[in-house]
């Protein structure tokens, strides 16, 4: 029950996170005009990954797409790439995790397969979240660098009476959305990985060894299997394999530790 809840919660958290990553990627407010030097401007500038916008006090907003690919800064291209990779991985992760959910029955899919899929989706969510966090952080770092560079420029070369106020940009809403969304996706991924461990408890699999005690004989098989009392009195025919002991009539089959490699 706890495993199902953990898996379900991980899925929901990741879903919200990926929706947030998509929203952040599409948002225009990655950087917004810093109004510290000119708080009474009638024109407000903000920029996204795909276009830059100008909002006038009148309510009119004009946006222009970045129609060049080669003319854009390499950092911006890198941020775009990270966000897109994050979305793609997240989307694939969601698709995989839907089939991995314990509460959803698909044919005669074994729990071992569900555990593998849960782990796969969890890893995908973790990488997706890291991509988003990295992308947003790279952009934020770029903003901070440009902010201080433009601040330095603002106070140099003002010999005359005329002031040329350089537009400085600060953190936009999309950055915070991206950070939170990336974090949620990461948390969701970790939860999926934890759920995977619950779906497939790791076993220590050895060959069954018989210990002969004087008088009353007990065949002890380590690894969580029932020890059958009475030497040679096994009514069930137990086959023993190298790499993992499983009975023919076991209803639930667990993956061995080698399945994770």
């Amino acid at each position: 029950m706890a495993v199902t809840a953990c898996q379900g919660l991980g899925f929901v958290v990741s879903l919200i996170g990926i929706a947030g990553i998509i929203a952040a990627t599409c948002m225009d407010q990655w950087s917004t005009q810093d109004l510290y030097n000119n708080p009474v401007t009638a024109v407000f500038n903000y920029q996204g990954l795909w276009r830059s916008c100008v909002r006038e006090s009148s309510g009119f907003t004009e946006c222009r797409g970045y129609f060049t690919l080669l003319g854009l800064p390499a950092m911006l291209q890198a941020v775009r790439a990270l966000m897109i990779v994050g979305i793609v991985l997240g989307a694939i992760g969601l698709l995989v995790s839907i089939f991995a959910l314990k509460c959803i029955r698909i044919g005669s899919m074994e729990d071992s397969a569900k555990a593998n899929m849960t782990l796969t989706s969890g890893i995908m969510f973790i990488v997706s979240g890291l991509c988003a966090i990295a992308g947003v952080s790279v952009f934020a770092n770029m903003l901070v660098t440009n902010f201080w560079m433009s601040t330095a420029n603002m106070y140099t070369g003002m010999g005359g009476m005329v002031q040329t106020v350089q537009t400085r940009y600060t953190f936009g809403a999309a950055l915070f959305v991206g950070w939170v969304a990336g974090g949620l996706t990461l948390i969701g991924g970790v939860m999926m990985c934890i759920a995977c461990r619950g779906l497939a408890p790791e076993e220590t699999n050895y060959k069954a060894v018989s210990y002969h005690a004087s008088g009353h004989s007990v065949a002890y098989k380590p690894g969580g299997f029932k020890a059958s009392t009475g030497f040679g009195s096994n009514t069930k025919n137990k086959k023993i394999y190298d790499g993992g002991a499983r009975t023919e009539d076991e209803v639930q089959s667990y993956p061995s530790k080698h399945d994770y490699v």
Epitope: Q33, N38, V40, T41, A42, V43, N45, Y46, Q47, S52, C53, V54, E56, S57, S58, G59, F60, E62, R64, V162, Q163, T164, V165, Q166, T167
Partner: antibody, heavy 116, light 113 residues
């Protein structure tokens, strides 16, 4: 067609307050902003303030303490209220429609004289 | 506040001549986001309200004759009337509409000989 018409008291005693109404037609106050501008006799234009479609306002910092602009969208009316009038507030008061921060249509103006 | 300085304050010219008047702002009116200069030119004829001539420093308002041309960027702007006509007798004002308060220049009075 777009029209703006100012109506005011004409004569105001010093230290009294001034109320001017700008009645608009041909456009909606929910879509356009309205500016107020005044012009003392024989002098240049002075921007007083603006009310935007959302109802938010911006004022001339020199007059902010005694100036108030409001509107009634349903009646298509914009109101200018100015307190503590002095003789140098004597001017022609205009309202004008905003278009992308420029004033494209102006009213004919209303003359206000501050005198005892 | 942004200070708008117009020159000359008055100008006496003959019909048919080319007229140039300038407007300087104490701060740049160029918005980097859309590369537009938020400067407007108005014409005010005697006894009339002002009339919008040019916005964004160089965009002519519809219905305005093409003899009126606005140019300039940043802090220095010019209004040119290519072939002056008798009906152009007026006062011309430039206005900052980039930063509050929206300040006007003192005007250039155009008189015809």
């Amino acid at each position: 067609q777009v029209q703006l018409k100012e109506s005011g008291p004409g004569l105001v005693a010093p230290s009294q307050s001034l109320s001017i109404t700008c009645t608009v037609s041909g456009f909606s106050l929910t879509s356009y902003g309205v500016h107020w501008v005044r012009q003392p006799p024989g002098k240049g234009l002075e921007w007083l303030g603006v009310i935007w479609p959302g109802g938010n306002t911006n004022y001339n910092s020199a007059l902010m303490s005694r100036l108030s602009i409001s509107k009634d969208n349903s009646k298509s009316q914009v109101f200018l209220k100015m307190n503590s009038l002095q003789t140098d507030d004597t001017a022609m008061y205009y309202c004008a429609r905003d278009r992308r921060l420029a004033m494209d249509y102006w009213g004919q103006g209303t003359s206000v004289t501050v005198s005892s | 506040d942004i200070v708008m300085t117009q020159s000359p304050s008055s100008l006496t010219v003959t019909a048919g001549e080319k007229v140039t008047m300038t407007c300087k702002s104490s701060q740049s009116l160029l918005n980097s986001g859309n590369q537009k200069n938020y400067l407007t030119w108005y014409q005010q004829k005697p006894g009339q309200p002002p009339k919008l001539l040019i916005y964004w420093a160089s965009t002519r308002e519809s219905g305005v004759p093409d003899r009126f041309t606005g140019s300039g960027s940043g802090t220095d702007f010019t209004l040119t009337i290519s072939i002056l006509q008798a009906e152009d007798l007026a006062v011309y004002y430039c206005q900052n509409d980039y930063s509050y308060p929206f300040t006007f220049g003192s005007g250039t009075k155009l008189e015809i000989k």
